[in-house]
Interface confidence: low
């Protein structure tokens, strides 16, 4: 014979030595219908605010205040916001590596500094985890025996410089 | 030649703003790539990193004292400036202010140190 | 922020001797690792940078060598100069932070 409790409704719990269908109490659910308790409700505070409220059959859901960010399954912890110089990881705030940086303030990811030398260029200030490596001007680089033109300003003659 | 020299109140009463300057000569901090750094030492202790600031006026600082922290510079005199706001007896130290290399991110010459002392 | 544990943090020596003083990272540093001596009531010195480069005008007795999060400073033969607090320091991520320093001095 089948016991009653079974066919009890999520929101409800039973007890078998007594199988009657009874609602939860306020502040507690039950996603299961038949379970012999109700879960007391989560309750959202401190860093915490609610994102969704609890019902008898559903629990509450929080999230983490403005400046924190949730950490662990159904964010179980807050943290706060990642600095510029770090990236969110599942782990939590990690600093960029060496070559990376990441210079917003709670989101982004670490990204790569400029490599100055691929367009020919001098670092002028190395980067750091919370900003990209300065470039300088083009690197002037002199093939034996260039000839550079010189025009100077308002004269209309140029001279010849022979860069040996 | 490259010298630094710092300068400071010498004394000062807690909860007061600490002022130092960096004077130096021999490089300018309008210089591309070129920086001048902050750096302090309290008496028998290690040495704490506190601020750069960086030829195009570019700041950065140390996140642990970040809020009371203000570097400045003035290119024309030449000088660097840091101020320390509300200060305890926990921020008595000699401080150095240093030059940093361009290309490489660190400090190659320094000052020969302020003393300051908070006291009530 | 990393930590620079620098030993020993007294070292007493011949002249002549080998010496050799240590700094480890609490994490990888890779190569970005200077060393500075500082003579009493002088300013600090930048000897080494970036684990093994000499600053010009260092005498060649100075050697640095390491990676990752090990690193030592040598001085080949002590001479009587030498007699001063050495302190390491990591610039491979920020805040840079410095070794709490060795006072060598002669014996």
């Known amino acids: 014979v089948q016991n009653s409790c079974d066919n009890c409704q999520p929101g409800t719990f039973c007890r078998k030595y007594n199988p009657v269908c009874k609602s939860c109490p306020p502040s507690t659910f039950s996603s299961i219908g038949g379970q012999p308790n109700c879960n007391i409700c989560r309750v959202c505070a401190g860093y915490f605010r609610f994102k969704k409220f609890c019902s008898s059959t559903h629990n509450a859901e929080c999230e983490c205040i403005e400046g924190f960010h949730c950490l662990g399954p159904q964010c179980t912890r807050c943290e706060k916001d990642c600095r510029p110089g770090q990236e969110l990881t599942k782990q939590g705030c990690k600093t960029c590596s060496l070559g990376t940086f990441n210079d917003q303030n709670g989101t982004g990811v670490c990204r790569p500094w400029t490599n100055c030398s691929l367009d020919g260029r001098s670092v002028l200030k190395t980067g750091t985890t919370e900003k990209d490596v300065v470039c300088g001007p083009p690197v002037v680089s002199f093939s034996p025996s260039t000839t550079i033109s010189v025009t100077p300003e308002g004269g209309p003659g140029g001279h010849s410089l022979q860069v040996l | 030649q490259v010298t630094l020299k710092e300068s400071g109140p010498g004394i000062l009463q807690p909860s007061q703003t600490l002022s130092l300057t960096c004077t130096f000569s021999?490089?300018?901090?309008?210089?591309?790539?070129?920086?001048v750094t902050w750096i302090r030492q309290p008496s028998g202790k290690g040495l704490e990193w506190l601020a750069n600031?960086?030829?195009?006026?570019?700041?950065d600082y140390n996140p642990s004292l970040k809020n009371r922290l203000t570097i400045s510079k003035d290119t024309s005199n030449p000088q660097a400036f840091l101020k320390i706001t509300n200060v305890d007896t926990a921020d008595t130290a000699t401080y150095y202010c240093?030059?940093?290399?361009?290309?490489?991110?660190?400090?190659?010459?320094w000052g020969q140190g302020v003393m300051v002392i908070v006291s009530s | 922020d990393i930590q620079m544990t620098q030993s020993p943090s007294f070292l007493s020596a011949s002249v002549g001797d080998r010496v050799t003083i240590n700094c480890k990272a609490s994490q990888n540093i890779n190569r970005y690792l200077n060393w500075y001596q500082q003579k009493l009531g002088e300013a600090p010195k930048l000897l080494m940078y970036n684990t093994n480069s000499m600053q010009t005008g260092i005498p060649s007795r100075f050697s640095g060598s390491g990676s990752g999060t090990d690193f030592t400073l040598t001085i080949s033969s002590l001479q009587p100069e030498d007699v001063a607090t050495y302190f390491c320091?990591?610039?491979?991520?920020?805040?840079?932070?410095f070794g709490g320093g060795t006072k060598l001095e002669l014996k």
């Open positions: 021999g490089f300018s901090l309008s210089t591309d790539g070129l920086g």
């Open positions: 320091l990591q610039h491979n991520s920020w805040p840079r932070t």
């Open positions: 240093a030059r940093i290399v361009p290309n490489s991110g660190h400090e190659d010459y």
């Open positions: 600031i960086w030829w195009d006026d570019d700041k």
